[in-house]
């Protein structure tokens, strides 16, 4: 039994880091493998993660952490019974994938303005809380070409757009994702999408 693709890990910079790797053949990850991880910190103890299958030869493990600070570094040991298959290390702050925003809501009752709001996925005491920026994706269910991205570079989790920038009388969907420039993170997953029917009063044309 050998590791074909070494484990790579990403952290949500809160409580979970996810590590994925591939073996050289079909593997029952949960029964055959264990990933041991330990914070490089005086008196800390090793923890064991039981991996799950992620495709035939792929394994994934969700490492639980109390919290994360920038100096944290973990040792990782991948074991198959008594055999050490791989040894490595992981610094969560250097491999951050933020949590996805939640509670995306479209408010359509504000005088021909669409107000989209969502929730910051981090608590106020987490470093990323004040460092997230967002991308909002809006698309038409009727017209695949009607697809747009709005970059929200301010901290407030909201976006205002004129309803008239979208077509009237048809349904739209929106979703939002986050990233943090300070840690050069990857983008989060998209939030669940929300749907609304776009309608607004056409301006009265005077000739």
């Amino acid at each position: 039994m050998k590791v074909l693709q070494e484990p790579t890990c990403v952290s949500d910079y809160m409580s979970i880091s996810t590590c994925e790797w591939k073996m050289n053949g079909p593997t029952n990850c949960s029964t055959e493998l264990r990933l041991l991880y330990q914070l490089v910190f005086l008196l800390s103890e090793a923890h064991t993660c039981i991996p799950e299958n992620n495709g035939g030869a792929g394994c994934v493990c969700h490492l639980l952490m109390d919290d994360v600070v920038s100096a944290d570094n973990y040792t990782l040991d991948l074991w198959a019974g008594q055999q050490l298959l791989w040894k490595g290390s992981f610094k969560p702050s250097e491999h951050v994938k933020p949590r996805a925003p939640g509670n995306l809501t479209v408010h359509t009752n504000v005088s021909d303005t669409l107000l989209l709001t969502w929730s910051n996925p981090y608590p106020p005491d987490n470093y990323l809380y004040n460092h997230l920026t967002y991308a909002v994706n809006i698309w038409s269910e009727n017209d695949p070409a009607d697809f747009r991205i709005y970059n929200v570079t301010y901290l407030e989790p909201s976006l205002r757009i004129a309803a008239s920038t979208l077509k009237s009388g048809i349904s739209y969907r929106a979703r939002v994702r986050a990233w943090a420039q300070c840690y050069n993170t990857t983008w989060s997953e998209w939030s669940p999408s929300t749907k609304w029917h776009n309608s607004y009063r056409e301006p009265f044309e005077q000739h």
Epitope: L39, V40, F41, L42, D66, A71
Partner: nanobody, 115 residues
Framework: QVQLVESGGGLVQPGGSLRLSCAAS?????MAWFRQAPGKEREAVAT????????YLADSVKGRFTISRDNSKNTLYLQMNSLKAEDTAVYYC???????????WGQGTLVTVSS
């Protein structure tokens, strides 16, 4: 120049309690309490990470000692309960920029547990 000033040591009867304090001139990733009993090597007793959420204790003191830090005052504490004669030692505060916790040391405070 980093300064660590310990206080709170003294003579206490077995089963008693003491609270040690350590004032630090700065914030550090790792803060720790070590102790050295007469004729023995210095050993780590308790450690705490920046932010103060994650704490670690040596097996010999689990359930009896707690470590905490007040980040606003840059002060480290060690609450010692149910003290035993074998806890007698000089207790040192130490801080570090990494998980080894040994970059800077205090001068030590003596704790004597005796009836």
């Amino acid at each position: 120049q980093v300064q660590l000033v310990e206080s709170g040591g003294g003579l206490v009867q077995p089963g008693g309690s003491l609270r040690l304090s350590c004032a630090a001139s700065g914030d550090f990733y790792c803060m720790a309490w070590f102790r050295q009993a007469p004729g023995k090597e210095r050993e780590a007793v308790a450690t705490i990470r920046s932010g103060g959420r994650s704490t670690y204790l040596a097996d010999s003191v689990k359930g009896r000692f707690t470590i905490s830090r007040d980040n606003s005052k840059n002060t480290l504490y060690l609450q010692m309960n149910s003290l035993k004669a074998e806890d007698t030692a000089v207790y040192y505060c130490a801080v570090g920029v990494d998980g080894n916790c040994r970059n800077y040391w205090g001068q030590g405070t003596l704790v004597t547990v005796s009836s």
